[in-house]
Amino acid sequence: LTCLGGFASPGPVPPSTALRELIEELVNITQNQKAPLCNGSMVWSINLTAGMYCAALESLINVSGCSAIEKTQRMLSGFCPHKVSAGQFSSLHVRDTKIEVAQFVKDLLLHLKKLFREGQFN
């Protein structure tokens, strides 16, 4: 075998693949959950039909020191066109209910599975 130059950069992930990978990660979290996820941390509930990806990140980014959701946080940061920092609530217009991270992940997973089934990759 001959080496023909350097490494080719991996192609961009199609939206459908990106969504599937996020779903797989959320499934992984829910299936591997033994102790309370993120020590039972509470996060803002979001409207899953309104600018969901940035809103989900704005909610989850405020959970620190929880390795179980770090990959999810990273993935969601790639799903949002603007940079999200802890304490930022621009997409989270309504902040009236807090839920446990575990419940948040389950709700997000159910909604993303529905979108995937319907072919809504945007």
Partner: antibody
Framework: EVQLVQSGAEVLKPGATVLISCKVS????????MHWVQQAPGKGLEWMGR????????KYAPKFHDRVTLTADTSTDTAYMELSSLRSEDTAVYYC???????????WGQGTLVTVSS | QAVVTQEPSLTVSPGGTVTLTCRSS?????????ANWVQQKPGQAPRGLIG???NRAPGVPARFSGSLLGDKAALTLSGAQPEDEAEYYC?????????FGTGTKVTVL
């Protein structure tokens, strides 16, 4: 005052590589994503990609992913766009633009004209 | 890859109202497309007007407003001024990349 100042026009031969800089002032470069947009003469806007200057994480448009590299130097508050294997159809004005929730595409560089000609 | 289409050209009278639309080939535009609208005048760099479907950028006059209209994103210009004559582009976010629309040339006549 927020400003994005890009490097000057370039004339290059097919197959060459161009590096365009975008120096920002009036804010800290790591606070926002930097997006890059191409506009060929008389044509519309085409999104090329974006970078998080804080950690170098990038997203690229499918059309450009194998030829474009976005980087940032936080010590000089400068973002860079490198486009390789240039061809005549890459002749265009290239813009850097800051994007955030409260200022979507609100700030743009002045544009850098790249001419690819043999 | 998705294709984002806009009306090629629209004409509005001074003081009148015009609505530009932005359609996605992949289906209905939703709030998760974070629809953006950008204005460009000849020989100038573009200028962001609207992001996140209906969020006006700083310094943008209130006569520009964004919304979802049926299955499309829309930009409404109410009380058009001569200086609003320009090319307008929408940009939709598809999970991990933007796609700009074909552009609409707005003439104030």
């Amino acid at each position: 005052e927020v400003q994005l100042v890009q490097s000057g026009a370039e004339v290059l031969k097919p197959g060459a590589t161009v590096l365009i800089s975008c120096k920002v002032s009036g804010y800290t470069i790591t606070d926002y994503y930097m997006h890059w947009v191409q506009q060929a003469p008389g044509k519309g806007l085409e999104w090329m990609g974006r970078i998080d200057p804080e950690d170098g994480e990038t997203k690229y448009a499918p059309k450009f992913h194998d030829r474009v590299t976005l980087t940032a130097d936080t010590s000089t508050d400068t973002a860079y766009m490198e486009l390789s294997s240039l061809r005549s159809e890459d002749t265009a004005v290239y813009y850097c633009t800051r994007y955030d929730y409260y200022g979507p595409f609100a700030y743009w560089g002045q544009g850098t004209l790249v001419t690819v000609s043999s | 890859q998705a294709v984002v289409t806009q009306e090629p050209s629209l004409t509005v009278s001074p003081g009148g109202t015009v609505t530009l639309t932005c359609r996605s080939s992949t289906g209905a535009v939703t709030t998760s497309n974070y629809a953006n609208w950008v204005q460009q005048k000849p020989g100038q760099a573009p200028r962001g007007l609207i992001g996140g479907t209906n969020n006006r950028a700083p310094g943008v006059p209130a006569r520009f407003s964004g919304s979802l209209l049926g299955d499309k994103a829309a930009l409404t210009l109410s009380g058009a001024q001569p200086e609003d004559e320009a090319e307008y582009y929408c940009a939709l976010w598809y999970i991990n990349h933007f796609i700009f629309g074909t552009g609409t040339k707005v003439t104030v006549l």
